[in-house]
């Protein structure tokens, strides 16, 4: 069997580091045979048998100039085996961050600190930490660890699929090449890496009759789950065409009525989704949704579209509005945006 | 020979933006991450943001989260520190610097000095 | 964030003296701490890298231990050439912090 311990990565091939001294094995000989080593292709014999250094050679101060492929023959001229050297350096510990859509799995991506120049790999895991006795400052890691499966095709991310909203978890991303290992870990709360996909299906309306207002209404991200437990909250802005700055509000729900638009102009409105409990942090804005206000007459009644701001408006005075729906909304698919504060009450 | 060296500082108001640059030379700069570290006038060393050699990961401090943008050019071996909405506190010298394992800081540039000022 | 605490925060010493220099972290760190030195004017100098281990080309009289939240920091006979502050810095985690320095003269 060969001398040569296979270092992982291609076969033959034999790793080192700059500025360092490093030994070449001579892969097809016994243990301490000793050997000539010459570089592929050329003649000049670069340590010959009586070095005493049996089936090693040793290059002092390896530089990018020694990298290539070396030949070892033994003592009859036989060939030995070759070896390529590629210089590069150990692992360094990798940059993790994770960030979760929803309350029931997170991801996390990796990137090198430092290019080593080998062949490198990933190891990914978990453990999920839990409290030690009364005091909940001490935690120390004790479930798992669990393998955190990685993408396929080699994207530099994986997905914990199942996570405990409340529960922390440690995540150990090991970065290995031939030279070693090393290791970031990284303490995860679902709570802090919060962050929804935006509002989906943001549509922007006129309200027939009345030239300020603006009906919008958007969709919970499709990325967040159905059961009613965790519900989000939305924020809101709009801005006539050619103005700079956003006007903002906090909806109730999944719609708003806009009653300061300015007559005639195209707005431009984008939705913004977070917990409702402001557990992690908000979602990018939507996509802009455009809508302009009408300019026709005034309907004989106004349908229950929910709460209207009350900014003054030159328009006639009208029946009073829907009363305002509660603030925390439940899921869209499970009740209707229009169900009465007492169907919403039952199911708090 | 291995250095940094940063520019782009200077006098600006409050609200106003600077583009800080640090052109890196003597080393593989495409294989390491980079960091800007600050130091305002008569106080202590603070790190302010980092980046991967790819780009693909950055952090930044508290401080300046949502103000300041880390970003490199790995073809042309910068980096750079575009700061935004700048305030007083962040009147101070800007150091470039070269981590080894993201945090081990064994390459400084001389430095830039940025001040915030009406 | 990871704090970083150091003390003495200046010190006064002779030529030839042994000076310590102590830091501490608010949580464990590992061996994920480093030291520098910043003359006046001038960038910080790597001097001890991962607690313990003397920088390429620093003098051996500057040395480093400890791990986990206790760090120390020694000059075993102090020169003219090291009045100075010197930072620690832990970087354990994604956020490097460094140590409010301590500024060191010669008496």
């Known amino acids: 069997s060969s001398p040569c311990p296979q270092a992982w990565g291609p076969p033959g091939v034999q790793y080192g580091q700059p500025g360092r001294s490093v030994k070449l094995c001579c892969p097809g000989v016994t243990a301490g045979d000793p050997v000539s080593w010459f570089r592929d292709g050329e003649p000049k014999l670069l340590q010959g048998p009586d070095s005493g250094l049996g089936h090693e050679l040793v290059l002092a101060q390896a530089d990018s100039t020694d990298e290539g492929t070396y030949i070892c023959q033994t003592l009859d001229g036989a060939l030995g085996g070759t070896v390529t050297l590629q210089l590069g350096y150990p692992p360094a510990r990798p940059v993790v961050s994770c960030q979760a859509a929803d309350y029931e799995n997170f991801s996390c991506t990796w990137s090198p600190s430092q290019i080593s120049g080998l062949p490198t790999r990933y190891l990914t895991s978990y453990r999920k930490k839990t409290v030690l006795g009364a005091d909940s400052q001490r935690r120390s890691p004790s479930t798992g660890p669990w393998p955190c499966p990685q993408d396929p095709l080699g994207a530099a991310r994986c997905v914990v699929h199942g996570a405990e909203f409340w529960s922390q978890y440690r995540i150990n991303v090991t970065e290995v090449n031939p030279l070693g290992a090393s290791t970031r870990l990284l303490d995860v709360s679902l709570q802090s890496i919060l962050r929804p996909d935006p509002p989906q299906g943001l549509r922007v309306e006129s309200v027939p009759g009345y030239p300020r207002r603006l009906r919008a209404s958007w969709t919970y991200p499709a990325s967040w789950p159905c059961q009613p437990h965790f519900l989000l909250k939305f924020r809101l802005q709009y801005r006539p065409a050619q103005h700079p700055a956003w006007s903002t509000v906090e909806p109730a729900g999944l719609e708003e009525v806009i009653t300061d638009a300015v007559a005639g102009l195209p707005h431009a409105v984008r939705v913004s989704a977070r917990d409702f409990l402001d557990a992690g942090t908000w979602s990018t804005w939507s996509p802009e949704a455009w809508g302009t206000p009408s300019t026709g007459t005034i309907p004989k009644e106004i349908p229950a579209w929910g709460q209207l701001h009350t900014q003054p408006e030159v328009e006639p005075q009208v029946d009073s509005p829907a009363p305002p729906r509660p603030s925390l909304q439940p899921h869209p698919r499970l009740l209707d945006h229009r169900d009465s504060v007492e169907q919403v009450a039952v199911l708090a | 020979e291995v250095q940094l060296l940063e520019s782009g500082g200077g006098l600006v108001q409050p609200g106003g933006s600077l583009r800080l640059s640090c052109a890196a030379s003597?080393?593989?700069?495409?294989?390491?991450?980079m960091t800007w570290v600050r130091q305002a006038p008569g106080k202590g060393l603070e790190w302010v943001s980092s980046?991967?050699?790819?780009?693909?990961?950055?952090q930044y401090a508290d401080s300046v989260k949502g103000r300041f943008t880390i970003s490199r050019d790995n073809s042309k071996n910068t980096l750079y520190l575009q700061m935004n909405s700048l305030r007083a506190e962040d009147t101070a010298v800007y150091y470039c610097?070269?981590?080894?394992?993201?945090?081990?800081?064994?390459?400084w540039g001389r430095g830039t000095l940025v001040t915030v000022s009406s | 964030d990871i704090q970083m605490t150091q003390s003495p925060s200046s010190l006064s010493a002779s030529v030839g003296d042994r000076v310590t220099i102590t830091c501490q972290a608010s949580?464990?760190?590992?061996?994920?701490l480093n030291w520098y030195q910043q003359k006046p004017g001038k960038a910080p100098k790597l001097l001890i890298y991962d607690a313990s281990n003397l920088q390429t080309g620093v003098p051996s009289r500057f040395s480093g231990s400890g791990s986990g939240t206790d760090f120390t920091f020694t000059i075993s006979s102090l020169q003219p050439e090291d009045i100075a502050t010197y930072y620690c810095?832990?970087?354990?985690?994604?956020?490097?912090?460094f140590g409010p320095g301590t500024k060191v003269d010669i008496k």
């Open positions: 003597g080393f593989t700069f495409s294989w390491y991450s």
């Open positions: 810095q832990q970087y354990d985690n994604l956020s490097p912090t």
């Open positions: 980046i991967v050699p790819s780009g693909g990961h950055t």
């Open positions: 949580q464990d760190i590992n061996n994920y």
């Open positions: 610097a070269k981590p080894e394992d993201w945090g081990l800081f064994d390459l």
